[in-house]
């Protein structure tokens, strides 16, 4: 499975969205879980609701929230108030009794608020756009793993 | 009409390869696991594994791991199970079966193949 | 793997008695995907009750099936002639999917 990287910006949500074929998967709860190593035990974080019918229900654990549209076959997670040690590599999981099928890989890497930095230097912002509530969680980039960038300095 | 169609009786010797069908009609063939069971004479009912036409992932049951493969052609909606190389122990009937899905989940398995007979005698 | 111990092994009663069939599992069956399937000689199994307790299509309502985790019931409350049979359980929640060694429902 290639791993989707996803980054976010500290303090604020991020939304990782996990499509599967809905019938391959139908009647399965759906896990999100955070890898511990490399070759580690995946430990789960949130599960979706345990009445499978009831699954577009939100269902929370800390400020991990999740979602599955059965229908459009899409789990939604969304870490609120992102923090750097939320950072890591993370599972969508299809849950079949004991066994967990990996459905998708996520590097979660979280950006640091330029706002916050304390070496910005005289940032100017205008008094109207000073918040950053409601910010487009889309506007986080997502690539494959497996493609080359150039690095950053 | 849902329906699962399996080849008809085999008689086979000890060592001899086999491979068996299931043919699904009346529904979208790779929207759904396919499942094989086992039946030795006078027994009960053997689990042997599973497969998902759509892209052909397939789970076995410990005891046929590696006795058996499960296969599917999408073309022809044809599940199979076949096998390189025939035991005395592997005369049984052997029916597929389809996963049902229900509004509230997973619905069990409904219907099932009418049965194939192989018999494996030297 | 999951075991299904399903008892008695074999129940003799007569037409329009109630028959008690009970299946329990080594572990705990989640979201309850157990069901109830009848085999009569020289046929393939037939699915009676999936999800513990919702009767498939075309099922009599003397059928029923109740219980959760590990401890499932199937229940015919007036045996018909054409009800004896063999009755087995499969849990289709963890692979493999295992069944239970049956239950044969003879007339006594």
């Known amino acids: 499975l290639n791993t989707t990287v996803l980054q976010g910006m500290a303090g604020q949500s991020l939304r990782v969205s996990c499509t599967y074929d809905a019938l391959k998967h139908w009647g399965r709860r759906k896990a999100w879980c955070r890898q511990l190593g490399e070759e580690g035990p995946c430990q789960r974080v949130v599960s979706t609701h345990g009445v499978w019918l009831l699954a577009f229900l939100k269902k929370r654990n800390g400020s991990t929230v999740i979602a599955d549209d059965t229908l459009a076959g899409t789990v939604t997670i969304t870490l609120k108030n992102l923090q750097a040690g939320d950072a890591g590599l993370y599972q969508c999981q299809s849950l079949r009794g004991r066994e967990a099928e990996v459905l998708q890989k996520v590097l979660v890497e979280v950006l640091e608020d330029p706002l916050d930095d304390q070496d910005a230097g005289d940032l100017w912002v205008p008094e109207e756009s000073s918040s950053f509530e409601g910010a487009q969680v889309e506007h986080s980039t997502s690539r494959n793993q497996e493609t080359s960038f150039p690095p950053t300095s | 009409e849902v329906q699962l169609v399996q080849s008809g009786a085999e008689v086979k010797k000890p060592g001899e390869s086999l491979k068996i069908s299931c043919k699904g009609s009346?529904?979208?063939?790779?929207?759904?696991?396919i499942g094989w069971v086992r039946q030795m004479p006078g027994k009960g009912l053997e689990w042997m594994g599973i497969?998902?036409?759509?892209?052909?992932?397939?789970r076995y049951s410990p005891s046929f791991q590696g006795q058996v493969t499960i296969s599917v052609d999408k073309s022809s909606s044809t599940a199979y199970l076949q096998w390189s190389s025939l035991k005395a122990s592997d005369t049984a009937i052997y029916y597929c079966?389809?996963?049902?899905?229900?509004?509230?989940?997973?619905?069990?398995?409904?219907?099932w193949g009418q049965g194939t007979l192989v018999t494996v005698s030297s | 793997e999951i075991v299904l111990t399903q008892s008695p092994g074999t129940l003799s009663l007569s037409p329009g008695e109630r028959a008690t069939l009970s299946c329990r599992a080594s572990?705990?069956?989640?979201?309850?995907?157990l069901a109830w399937y009848q085999q009569k000689p020289g046929q393939a199994p037939r699915l009676l009750i999936y999800g513990a307790s919702s009767r498939a299509t075309g099922i009599p309502d003397r059928f029923s099936g109740s219980g959760s985790g590990t401890d499932f019931t199937l229940t015919i409350s007036r045996l018909e002639p054409e009800d004896f049979a063999l009755y087995y359980c499969q849990q289709y929640d963890t692979s493999p999917f295992t069944f239970g060694p049956g239950t044969k429902v003879d007339i006594k």
């Open positions: 009346g529904y979208t063939f790779t929207s759904y696991w």
């Open positions: 497969i998902y036409p759509g892209d052909s992932d397939t």
């Open positions: 572990q705990s069956v989640s979201s309850s995907y």
């Open positions: 079966t389809r996963q049902a899905i229900a509004v509230t989940g997973l619905g069990g398995f409904d219907p």
